[in-house]
């Protein structure tokens, strides 16, 4: 059974031309480190993406076809997320267990660069995506996924890792960003908000979505994650926005129905294997791509982010379950687990489709075209 999904024909969030500057003060959610303009000592700039050596071609995979009859989102609101809170809610929960207060958190102290210097780097994630400023890169071909439809056995580990819900993926899930850019999926996790407050990490024209899924991949050029951290293209994350729709999403329900079992920080359970690709949008051909970082400490850079243009729909009840079931550190609900958007600092977001071409009346100013720097051009 396919998911109810929304098909974006115009770019997410509509479009208007603008500068490559970070969002204003109104878009500082639960963040702790103010964006830095200069490099921290010893942090290298990681400019364009490099092709990684020693990689073989993946078996050819047929890209997903566009679904017919899916909803259009011509009028997605482009307003700022209203009053993103500075800190997550702190609700009393069972007995206190805190030790020292040096661990990183969403909101409040300590500032992330003090926790991990890389968090002050120039090329951090998440970012605000401005479709009008994205560079159309015809070389960005549809993503290729192989082996993502998992059988029920062996079961997978679903865990409350303290700041998110995380599903560990078995070996054999292959993903290609393009020729010679092959990856293996490692895990997926989610970011969300709270009741009535959106919690995606990336934003589009300042619009924050209810939630966001990240599927983390390791380049086949590396044997281990710690070897790949900080290396350009060492890690790749597929990101998709989750939105509210009228129907229950059956794929997500397989995970959401088990959250009660892992309400406690650090707890885990086993869930049957499922079709991981069903958690993602169906259109693998339209996406934005840029080089950024992990969105939590250690904030390692060199991560290739691919953000789908199409969104995934969950029911209101499912989004509520996601944001209202888990507990995190300090006896607080695990909510609002997203980092503020970070400055682009000269980075150009690339698009696999002409995202800057928008016939809507919003695009009154001339479209600023950025040049395509994609690998393979």
């Amino acid at each position: 059974q396919r998911l109810p999904r929304m098909q974006e024909d115009s770019p997410l969030g509509g479009g208007s031309s603008g500068e490559d500057d970070p969002l204003g003060e109104e878009d500082l959610p639960s963040e702790e480190d103010s964006p830095r303009e200069e490099d921290p000592p010893g942090e290298e700039d990681l400019p364009g993406e490099e092709d990684l050596p020693g990689e073989e071609d993946l078996p050819e995979v047929k890209p997903k076809s566009e679904e017919e009859g899916s909803l259009k989102l011509e009028d997605l609101p482009t307003v700022e997320a209203p009053g993103d809170p500075q800190e997550p809610q702190n609700n009393a929960h069972r007995d206190k267990e805190g030790d020292d207060q040096s661990h990183w958190r969403y909101g409040g102290d300590p500032p992330w660069p003090r926790v991990s210097p890389a968090c002050a780097g120039r090329f951090q994630s998440p970012v605000d995506i401005r479709p009008q400023l994205a560079a159309f890169c015809p070389a960005l071909r549809p993503l290729e996924l192989l082996g993502f439809q998992l059988p029920p056995l062996p079961e997978l580990r679903l865990r409350n890792n303290g700041h998110s819900v995380q599903l560990t993926l078995p070996p054999g899930l292959e993903m290609a960003l393009g020729p010679g850019r092959e990856y293996r999926a490692l895990q997926l996790h989610l970011h969300w908000g709270a009741a009535g407050r959106p919690g995606s990490e990336h934003t589009v024209e300042g619009h924050r979505f209810p939630a966001e899924i990240h599927v983390v991949h390791l380049s086949t050029a590396f044997a281990r994650v710690d070897e790949a951290l900080g290396r350009p293209g060492g890690l790749a994350v597929l990101a998709a926005f989750l939105e509210e729709g009228p129907e229950e999403n059956s794929a997500y329900e397989q995970l959401l129905s088990r959250l009660e079992e892992i309400a406690e920080e650090g707890s885990e359970t086993q869930v049957p294997g499922l079709d991981i690709s069903a958690l993602l949008p169906s259109d693998f051909s339209r996406y934005f791509q840029y080089e950024g970082s992990l969105t939590t400490p250690p904030c390692a850079q060199g991560v290739i982010w691919t953000v789908f243009n199409q969104t995934v729909m969950l029911s209101a009840k499912q989004l509520h379950t996601l944001s209202d079931t888990l507990w995190g550190p300090g006896d607080s609900r695990l909510q609002l687990n997203f980092r503020a958007t970070q400055p682009l600092n000269g980075r150009v977001i690339e698009a696999s489709f002409p995202a800057g071409v928008d016939s809507s009346p919003r695009a009154a100013e001339p479209v600023q075209l950025n040049s395509c720097l994609a690998a393979g051009d």
Epitope: E97, D99, D100, S102, H103, W104, P110, V115, S116, R157, R159, N160, N161, G162, H163, S164, T168, L186, Q187, H189, H214, V216, R224, V225, D226, L229, E264, E265, G266, S267, E268, L294, T295, T296, P297, P298, A300, G328, P329
Partner: nanobody, 133 residues
Framework: QVKLEESGGDLVQPGGSLRLSCAAS????????IGWFRQAPGKEREGVSC????????YYADSVKGRFTISRDNAKNMVYLQMNSLKPEDTAIYYC??????????????????????????WGQGTQVTVSS
């Protein structure tokens, strides 16, 4: 070859002290949370103390607070567990474990210390600690 290896376990009298060592080889602990776990006969494995190399945060189980101290030697890629005022109930096999810290793995040291099953990235073989007179 990537591995964790514990050492330092021994037979000690109640009230005595021991220092356990965990040597990481084949990888650096820089991006990891490191935990000491123990399993007594007939009991579940429990997290004793956990430490994050990323943000320096530490966690101790209530049963060992004030008696045990976790530390790391960056140059030697080692993690230690200093155990003082040992009690008979501290008798167990002690394991060292490491898992990526942050969104890629375990995001808090409390969560790390609740990994009672060998689901972490790396686990050692264990070292026996016996507290008896």
């Amino acid at each position: 070859q990537v591995k964790l290896e514990e050492s330092g376990g021994d037979l000690v009298q109640p009230g005595g002290s021991l220092r356990l060592s965990c040597a990481a080889s084949g990888f650096t602990l820089d991006y990891y949370a490191i935990g000491w776990f123990r399993q007594a006969p007939g009991k579940e494995r429990e997290g004793v103390s956990c430490f994050s190399s990323v943000d320096g945060s530490t966690y101790y189980a209530d049963s060992v607070k004030g008696r045990f101290t976790i530390s790391r030697d960056n140059a030697k890629n080692m993690v230690y567990l200093q155990m003082n005022s040992l009690k008979p109930e501290d008798t167990a096999i002690y394991y060292c474990a490491a898992e990526l810290y942050g969104e890629l793995g375990v995001a808090t040291v409390q969560a790390m210390c609740r990994l009672t099953t060998p689901g972490g990235d790396y686990w050692g073989q264990g070292t026996q600690v016996t507290v008896s007179s």
